[in-house]
């Protein structure tokens, strides 16, 4: 899917509203020194390339991240403010299915998460050096 | 401390596509970062061609689009570039590269291919 | 596609001297900037990032600075092994990542 067409200050106002919030919850208990990311991005499509793909593409170390709060809040934020995604996600719904129903949060699924963190708040800064 | 090496056919006859696998050691390729190749005509510039996450998103440079496909198997540690319908103008030092898909911290000592019948 | 337009093409310089080596986009890309080092039949070496960050084990005599359009290289006292072939990147126009030509340093 290509993101050149979203409507950025929307996402941007629904991620410090809700997902935020999501993710950190998700990482309560930990220090953002705990992890070094090793991810970017460079311009606001290549944020929620990186983010969507890093959200919902499940990894072998950690399968379950599609089924979290934040990610499902990520799908309905991306399917409202972006023109045509909800169409190409159907691939990623079936994924999201096929995802683990445990929730042991597992270290490695919560470095994951420090690194979509770290792509969102990297997402916010091309967006402020936009403006 | 994070080793790459490219390997792979130094001649590749024209219109046949050229295949390398670079080989990553002291790293997971599956733990972090991106993992990329650039490639250098003789005597010339640096030009980027791709790279793949380690969680598996792709991205292209748009010129190499149609020709390029990146791969990976992370059971060997190993990550692969494909490029088809080659030309003379694909003549080149290929190297693979880390890279936190912005820029590129530790490259392969390159391999060169040349593109001729 | 943003293009960088390196100068010069090759500085003659002797060792202990100031190199100023310059880079220029042809729109902004902010401090999304990298330099590299490159020797003769080796790979290219990661100098600095975001315009001005030196990476891990680069000597403080390379420094980094320019936002914009603008961006300078500079190697206070010529070692020498600082002859080589310096070309900046750019990483603001993704996915078009893009490279300047290059300034060759050469031992006047």
């Known amino acids: 899917y290509d993101f050149t067409n979203c409507d950025f200050q929307k996402i941007e106002a629904d991620y410090l509203r809700t997902i935020s919030k999501d993710l950190i919850t998700y990482m309560s208990g930990t220090k953002s020194t705990d992890f070094n990311n090793t991810v970017s991005c460079s311009n606001r499509p290549h944020c929620l390339t990186e983010i969507q793909s890093l959200t919902f593409n499940p990894t072998p170390r950690c399968a379950s991240l599609a089924k979290e709060m934040f990610a499902r809040k990520t799908k309905a934020t991306l399917a409202l403010w972006c023109p045509g995604y909800s169409e190409t996600q159907i691939n990623a719904t079936q994924a999201m299915k096929k995802a683990r129903k445990s929730k042991v949060t597992t270290n490695k699924c919560l470095e994951q998460v420090s690194q979509l963190l770290g792509l969102w708040r990297r997402f916010i800064r091309t967006l402020l050096k936009k403006q | 401390q994070v080793q790459l090496q490219e390997s792979g056919p130094g001649l590749v006859k024209p219109s046949e596509t050229l295949s390398l696998t670079c080989t990553v050691s002291?790293?997971?390729?599956?733990?972090?970062?991106?993992w990329s190749w650039i490639r250098q005509p003789p005597g010339k510039g640096l030009e980027w061609i791709g790279y793949i996450s380690y969680y598996g998103s792709i991205s292209y440079n748009p010129s190499l689009k149609s020709r390029v496909t990146i791969s990976r198997d992370t059971s060997k540690n190993q990550f692969s570039l494909k490029l088809s319908s080659v030309t003379a103008a694909d003549t080149a030092v290929y190297y693979c590269a880390r890279t936190n898909l912005l820029y590129f911290d530790s490259w392969g000592q390159g391999t060169l291919v040349t593109v001729s019948s | 596609e943003i293009v960088l337009t390196q100068s010069p093409a090759t500085l003659s310089l002797s060792p202990g001297e100031r190199a100023t080596l310059s880079c220029r986009a042809s729109q902004s890309v902010s401090n999304n900037l990298a330099w590299y080092q490159q020797k003769p039949g080796q790979a290219p070496r990661l100098l600095i990032y975001d315009a001005s960050s030196r990476a891990t084990g680069i000597p403080a005599r390379f420094s980094g600075s320019g936002s914009g359009t603008d961006f300078t290289l500079t190697i206070s006292s010529l070692e020498p092994e600082d002859f080589a072939v310096y070309y900046c990147q750019q990483y603001s126009d993704w996915p078009q990542y893009t490279f300047g030509q290059g300034t060759k340093v050469e031992i006047k």
């Open positions: 002291g790293y997971s390729i599956s733990s972090g970062y991106g």
